[in-house]
Interface confidence: low
């Protein structure tokens, strides 16, 4: 019975040099054969000649010829077992077999590392018929070998549903060293040790490594790959690379820049995104990070008013999202704003200062010393007050809003009056007699209406009462001032 040996993927053997059954070449063609120019017996083993012992699969035909002579076993001829060549060279190798003419439809397929080679490969099968046998030569050529062409190649032939397998042909592609690990760019702290790694492979092995710093070799004695270089520390940026050498020559890795961490550059493009009476939203574009991630930023704010005491307010924030709302500012004020950011090394300089202004706001305090009294002769209530301090007006005063609430026998009615900004007194008509009038006043700017003053109450008697006295804003501590006349 015929057995089938499936070729498993396996590494090609590494030999130190040429040996019986191997061929070292950088040339094309290798073992090339004539193209249909006739039979060349010198390159063939005749089926009738005794062959060397063979490890490939053998098919023993059961069919006999007319003369009833048994047919010899079928097997691929021995050929070169190991081809060593350089990358990008061409190579051609073949399998040959002599098949009795009684067999029809024989096909040969090529396999590499256990997988059939289909399609894009250059394989040619040639037939050289004779009286009794046909010599079949299957050639396989690669015009420019790559490392990926390394491996074990075999031929397979199917006859009568049986499979014949050739000895393997090992292809070993040698070339310049190939990097499997190159040094990586790094950002390091000044005068602090760090490691760089370099690894390269052949074939051919061994691969030796030299390190290069700023175009000068670091080690005069090569190290076997892989190599780790320990740099005790740098004071300035340097470029490192490694050279990998083998018998074919040398390959140089990419040059990598080792940067020294430094303080960041100052932020740029500080912009005012919006401003309100008491806050300013700013954004900025971070400067160069000094090869170390930003940790946080500091917003420095000082009053631009030449009469201010020049003190600087500091607001700390995270480095992202380059946006900050500065709060608790005064209304209608000018500020100089600068931004500084830090990384693990330290703080950047402050950005160019920009000028920003807050808008008008509603006043933050109510009018002071509100006094209310009854002018019975004219049936009016007179109201007087003092305007709030300028600093707390938060804008240009445009007037006052007066709320007066009249309460009598369960009925309550609120009325609002507007007064121009120059006034500090107002007169309102008595709405209801025998009632309590509660007065509150708020200052008004274009930014809005401020808080109302504490309520001041006055009792308006029925017609005919004569005595009256003023009501006024209470001294601190009196919760609900009422003056009953």
């Amino acid at each position: 019975a015929i057995t089938e040996a499936r070729e498993e993927a396996k590494p090609y053997p590494l030999f130190p040099g040429p040996f019986p059954g191997s061929l070292q070449t950088d040339h094309t063609p290798l073992l090339s054969l004539p193209h249909a120019s006739g039979y060349q017996p010198a390159l063939m083993f005749s089926p009738t000649q005794p062959g060397r012992p063979h490890t490939g699969n053998v098919a023993i035909p059961q069919v006999t010829s007319v003369e009833s002579k048994p047919l010899p076993p079928l097997a691929f001829k021995h050929t070169v077992g190991h081809i060593i060549l350089s990358e990008h060279k061409g190579v051609k190798f073949n399998c040959s077999i002599s098949v009795p003419n009684i067999y029809q439809d024989t096909t040969i397929s090529w396999w590499k590392d256990g997988k059939e080679l289909l399609g894009a490969h250059h394989a040619i099968t040639q037939f050289y018929p004779d009286d009794e046998v046909t010599a079949i030569i299957a050639s396989f050529s690669i015009t420019s070998v790559q490392r990926s062409d390394n491996g074990s190649y075999i031929c397979k032939m199917k006859i009568n549903n049986e499979e014949i397998v050739s000895d393997p042909i090992y292809i070993e592609v040698q070339g310049l060293p190939h990097f499997t690990k190159q040094p990586e760019s790094m950002n390091v702290t000044r005068n602090t040790a760090f490691n760089l790694t370099c690894q390269a492979v052949g074939p051919p092995e061994p691969v030796n490594i030299f390190w290069v710093q700023n175009s000068s070799r670091v080690n005069e004695q090569p190290e076997k790959s892989p190599s780790v270089l320990t740099v005790p520390g740098l004071t300035e940026m340097a470029v490192f690379s490694c050279e990998a050498h083998n018998d074919k020559g040398l390959t140089v890795s990419k040059g990598v820049q080792i940067n020294i961490k430094a303080i960041p550059s100052p932020p740029t493009e500080v912009s005012i995104r919006n401003s309100t009476a008491h806050s300013i939203l700013i954004s900025w574009v971070p400067g160069f990070d000094g090869y170390s991630p930003f940790r946080n930023c500091s917003i420095q704010v000082k009053e631009a008013d030449p009469l201010s005491n020049g003190s600087v307010m500091i607001f700390n924030t995270s480095a992202l999202p380059h946006l900050y709302q500065i709060k608790q500012l005064q209304a209608l004020a000018n500020y100089s704003i600068g931004v500084s950011c830090m990384n693990e090394i330290g703080w950047s300089a402050v950005s160019p200062w920009i000028l920003a202004s807050t808008t008008e706001g509603a006043p933050s305090v109510a009018p002071l010393n509100v006094t209310v009294f009854l002018n019975e002769s004219s049936d009016n209530v007179d109201i007087r007050w003092m305007k709030p301090p300028t600093k707390q007006q938060d804008g240009e005063l445009v007037g006052y809003r007066i709320s007066h609430v009249w309460q009598s026998a369960g009925i309550s009615k609120e009325l609002l009056e507007e007064v121009g900004q120059n006034g500090s007194r107002a007169r309102i008509s008595v709405q209801v007699h025998n009632a309590t009038c509660t007065v509150r006043i708020a200052a008004v700017t274009r930014g809005g209406v401020g808080p109302f003053s504490d309520p001041v109450k006055i009792f308006i008697p029925a017609h005919g009462w004569v005595d009256y006295a003023p009501s006024s804003t209470p001294a601190p501590g009196n919760a609900d001032p009422v003056l009953i006349i």
Epitope: E269, S271, N274, S283, H322, L323
Partner: antibody, heavy 118, light 107 residues
């Protein structure tokens, strides 16, 4: 992906008001200011104003302060611009545009063509 | 408010030519942005922070300038560059202001 969807066209009579919409998708609506820009036929771009969806704070170009009111609906990620007392001068394409952290108008709607005509 | 004046208002150039559009500010600004707009479409952010190209903008475009004088340059004009270009500032704001635009046509 970031998208700002605006109705293609609106036709209104002089003196009326109109509310233009801009529906945002593909990003966190409250994190980015929304701007509105006007472009009259064959003319350049004019900035109307901007609104911060996190707290509805708006800044206006003084020229459009009495004409436009910016608002939004966070639940539907939609920004609105109300234009009042319309005249033929208000006929234009109105764009909404998203503003990133650096103040760049990085995504724009397709624009709504407003025609004011009797 | 800062007024931006673009020049020229309209220009025509041949493919392969170098083209420069300028934008002059009435007072100093920190940086400039540029937008490209083609007929019937929305403006597209083209250059930001004076000289940085927005995503997808070809490398033949560049921006430069400082203070009150800024420019957009196309090193070798291509047919697809025909459009109107607007400069925009927001370092003095509000309001944000745009230039009146430069219409670039192909000869």
């Amino acid at each position: 992906q970031v998208q700002l969807q605006q109705p293609g066209a609106e036709l209104v009579v002089p003196g009326a008001s109109v509310r233009l919409s801009c529906k945002a998708s593909g990003y966190t609506f409250i994190n980015y200011w929304m701007h509105w820009v006007k472009q009259r036929p064959g003319q350049g771009l004019e900035w109307i104003g901007e609104i911060d969806p996190s707290d509805s704070y708006a800044n206006y170009n003084q020229k459009f302060k009495d004409k436009s009111t910016l608002s939004l609906d966070k639940s539907s990620s939609t920004a609105y611009m109300q234009l009042s007392s319309l005249t033929s001068e208000d006929s234009a394409v109105y764009y909404c545009a998203r503003c990133d952290y650096y103040g760049r108008l990085d995504y724009w709607g397709q624009g709504t063509t407003l025609t004011v005509s009797s | 408010q800062v007024v931006l004046t673009q020049s020229p208002a309209i220009m025509s150039a041949s493919p392969g030519e170098k083209v420069t559009i300028t934008c002059s500010a009435s007072s100093s600004v920190s940086y400039m942005l540029w937008f490209q707009q083609k007929p019937g479409t929305s403006p597209k952010l083209w250059i930001y922070s004076t000289s940085n190209l927005a995503s997808g903008v070809p490398a033949r475009f560049s921006g430069s300038g400082s203070g009150t004088s800024y420019s957009l340059t196309i090193s070798r004009l291509e047919a697809e560059d025909a459009a109107t270009y607007y400069c925009q500032q927001r370092s003095s704001y509000p309001p944000i202001t745009f230039g009146a635009g430069t219409k670039l046509e192909l000869k």
